[in-house]
């Protein structure tokens, strides 16, 4: 199996994490996609997901998380706005493809959120960085409960995150043929 790697972001409270997950266009364009947190000793837990089938360029908002799937470009944009210290933790994008196990998108994201006024537009009320005008058509998608038949033999890396999430969890294994690329933070 390919070694799992992490990309680390160190941000201040109030800023926005903004990443995009690239996927193989032909295979996964309309597949449902999800943003997950990996807590210490637990299986990945879904925080937000796109609709099924995933709609093109259609924002889905769950709390402070916004997902947008751009089919034509093969990428899922994930934003976590108005970051809080307790959002710190390990995250990943996955693609649902039942009955098979979800695909994980490289790389996992290690988010470190620290207290304090950052002095950047990310912490200002007037900033476009953390004040997103979500279209009125924004939807909340229901994330499926997906249990892998396999078990995890090793606990995921330690995470300090404690995030309020929907009641859906996903077990997944290591599929790492897809690349994740950072965008604006």
């Amino acid at each position: 199996a390919t070694k799992l790697t992490e990309e680390k972001y160190e941000l201040k409270e109030g800023q926005t994490l903004d990443v995009k997950c690239d996927y193989t266009l032909e295979k996964f364009a309309s597949s449902q996609k999800a943003w997950q947190i990996i807590r210490d000793g637990e299986m990945p837990k879904t925080l937000a997901c796109t609709e099924r089938p995933s709609k093109n360029s259609h924002p889905v908002q769950v709390g402070r998380i916004i997902l947008e799937d751009y089919h034509d470009h093969g990428l899922l944009r994930v934003r976590m706005v108005n970051l809080q210290v307790e959002d710190s933790g390990l995250y990943q994008c996955v693609i649902y493809q039942p009955p098979k196990e979800p695909h994980m998108l490289f790389d996992r994201i290690r988010l470190v959120v620290t207290k304090g006024f950052s002095g950047t537009p990310g912490s200002n009320e007037n900033s476009t960085q953390n004040v997103y005008k979500i279209p009125p058509t924004t939807t909340k998608a229901l994330c499926p409960l997906y249990t892998s038949p396999r078990t995890v033999t090793q606990a995921p890396p330690k995470s300090t995150a404690d995030v309020s999430t929907p009641d859906s969890e996903i077990n997944l294994t290591n599929v790492t043929d897809i690349i994740r690329v950072p965008v604006f933070n």
């Epitope: 790697t5 990309e7 680390k8 972001y9 160190e10 941000l11 201040k12 800023q15 995009k20 690239d22 751009y70 470009h73 990428l75 944009r77 490289f106 790389d107 470190v112 620290t114 950052s118 950047t120 537009p121 990310g122 476009t128 960085q129 997103y132 690349i179 994740r180 690329v181 950072p182 965008v183 604006f184 933070n185």
Partner: antibody
Framework: QVQLVQSGAEVKRPGSSVKVSCKAS????????ISWVRQAPGQGLEWMGG????????NYAQRFQDRVTITADESTRTAYMELSSLRSEDTAVYYC??????????????????WGQGTTVTVSS | DIQMTQSPTSLSASVGDRVTITCRAS??????LAWYQHKPGKAPKLLIY???SLQSGVPSRFSGSGSGTDFTLTISSLQPEDFATYYC?????????FGQGTKVEIK
């Protein structure tokens, strides 16, 4: 091979505006951050802001936020930087640069890897 | 904003010298740091990205190291074409910021 070609030199009066264009040829345009960086005479490089054409929402450095407007037109593969209320200290070379894109390494953000040739803007009365 | 402080601001060196430039971030930026070479009348050129990855086409005498707040650009054996100004730049968090530059001059 991606190339960024900028518009020509401009001479402007204080208080006026200038709009510099940056046209991409070759490669993908929509999913890259197109950044604008300037260098005033005798000064260092300064990041002004940038935009991902696909997403359309610009991000600005705080000191330029009130005066700069960055836009992009996907159909013509062109990014624009408009700076208003010009003053003499805005005299500088303005560069556009490609910010990042998909890659084959784990660190798939490549820095500002492709730059335009620069546009000299002179503000003088 | 994250402040990037380079040192020295200028240095004089001879061809063949080993040159080291440091860059310090005012807060942690993980490995999200790039180094650029800039010559008068030309566009800046990316040398190093992600703190230590060599950009395609850049000679191997250039190397980068560091993570968190302290970073280093090293030119193992200075060549005549290396005399220029060098900048570090962070892209861990918006707004991206550059160091003030280090001018490498001929001794």
């Amino acid at each position: 091979q991606v190339q960024l070609v900028q518009s020509g030199a401009e001479v402007k009066r204080p208080g006026s505006s200038v709009k510099v264009s940056c046209k991409a040829s070759g490669g993908t345009f929509s999913i890259y951050v197109i950044s604008w960086v300037r260098q005033a005479p005798g000064q260092g490089l300064e990041w002004m802001g940038g935009i991902i054409p696909l997403f359309g929402t610009p991000n600005y450095a705080q000191r330029f936020q009130d005066r700069v407007t960055i836009t992009a037109d996907e159909s013509t593969r062109t990014a624009y930087m408009e700076l208003s209320s010009l003053r003499s200290e805005d005299t500088a070379v303005y560069y556009c640069a490609r910010g990042h894109g998909p890659g084959s390494s784990h660190y798939s953000y490549y820095g500002l890897d492709v730059w335009g040739q620069g546009t000299t803007v002179t503000v003088s009365s | 904003d994250i402040q990037m402080t380079q040192s020295p601001t200028s240095l004089s060196a001879s061809v063949g010298d080993r040159v080291t430039i440091t860059c310090r971030a005012s807060q942690g930026i993980s490995s999200w740091l790039a180094w650029y070479q800039h010559k008068p009348g030309k566009a800046p050129k990316l040398l190093i990205y992600a703190a230590s990855s060599l950009q395609s086409g850049v000679p191997s005498r250039f190397s980068g190291s560091g993570s968190g707040t302290d970073f280093t650009l090293t030119i193992s054996s200075l060549q005549p074409e290396d005399f220029a100004t060098y900048y570090c730049q962070q892209y861990n968090s918006y707004p991206w910021t550059f160091g003030q530059g280090t001018k490498v001059e001929i001794k």
